[in-house]
């Protein structure tokens, strides 16, 4: 499956929206930095098969959607930007779902990618626990926004690599 160009553009648009969502000066949030342990190895195209990487992207976008769909998130960000962000994520989920089912049979997906999906879920669990611990403060959300932007950037670069391999 060739990841469509529109998916990469969608990822870039999602990044732009994330960048625009900032509400407070990031400089005041330095002491709130945290090691979320982004599971980079899960997205390493050299070690893992394409279907696994795509499956991990899918889980990451799904978890991002879940994270930004909460009531606490709605209170933290601009509603218009948030709605546009949901649309981009939803479109990417559709693209990736089509891609994963084309790559391997639906039955195999769950078994084959269990470890990578679990790693992504644990990563988002750490993010959620961090936000809870910080009582969903504006700085905690800024740190999370920066983290999600970094993980999106990483996956965008890998997607370019996957397309080149085809």
């Amino acid at each position: 499956c060739d990841l469509p160009q529109t998916h990469s553009l969608g990822n870039r648009r999602a990044l732009i929206l994330l960048a625009q969502m900032g509400r407070i000066s990031h400089f005041s949030c330095l002491k709130d930095r945290y090691d979320f342990g982004f599971p980079q190895e899960v997205f390493d195209g050299n070690q893992f098969q394409k279907a696994q990487a795509i499956s991990a992207f899918h889980e990451m976008i799904q978890q991002t959607f879940n994270l930004f769909s909460t009531k606490d998130s709605s209170a933290a960000w601009d509603e218009t930007l948030l709605d546009k962000f949901y649309i981009e994520l939803f479109q990417q989920l559709n693209d990736l779902e089509a891609c994963v089912t084309q790559e391997v049979g639906v039955e195999e997906i769950a078994l084959m990618n269990e470890d990578s999906i679990l790693a992504v879920r644990k990563y988002f669990q750490r993010i959620t626990l961090y936000l809870m611990g910080k009582k969903y403060s504006p700085c905690a959300w800024e740190v999370v926004r920066a983290e999600i932007m970094r993980s999106f950037s990483f996956s965008t670069n890998l997607q370019k690599g996957l397309r080149r391999k085809d």
Epitope: H26, F27, C29, L30, K31, D35, A146, E147, M149
Partner: antibody, heavy 121, light 107 residues
Amino acid sequence: EVQLVQSGAEVKKPGESLKISCKGSGYSFTSYWIGWVRQMPGKGLEWMGIIDPSDSDTAYSPSFQGQVTISADKSISTAYLQWSSLKASDTAMYYCARHPGLNWAPDFDYWGQGTLVTVSS
Amino acid sequence: DIQMTQSPSSLSASVGDRVTITCRASQSISKFLNWYQQKPGKAPKLLIYFASSLQSGVPSRFSGSGSGTDFTLTISSLQPEDFATYYCQQSNTLPFTFGQGTKVEIK
């Protein structure tokens, strides 16, 4: 390969203006902040200020607030440090360095080669 | 501003020696402490970040420890290329501040 390339050495007279540059390459310029550090001859490192090139938000050390201006042009991946009226005490080596912002990653992991500014009448 | 105080300001040591440099912050900075090495005419080089994480490409003889206000940089076995000036720097809050530096000289 990540690189920060600074503009060349400058010799100026007191009262003159100056703008030095720091061009980033090999990474996403807007994903990192750019900090500026001064080192006067034979002295230690002094942190001057920082800019987030994604939105040009800046922060200065109180010692340098109002003395210098930090700016960036993300379209050409370049940060700037400028003076409107130089003094002899501005004579120093100026370094730029990148910072990962709010991400959990090494601080100031890449530095420019430095720009020597000499102010003398 | 957070003040960073390094000690000693200079030291003389021989190749193979174990060298320890300390850095004290005027208030708690958690683990947001970096160590840099600078040689004459060169830009500083990051050695240790977040108090104890070794920067990629830096020899394992360099190590960092500490949290809160007291931090240490240790060179387990000094090599000829290690003679330089070392700076600590806090990145807990702006403005970032550096220690005054520790010059490591040949005995």
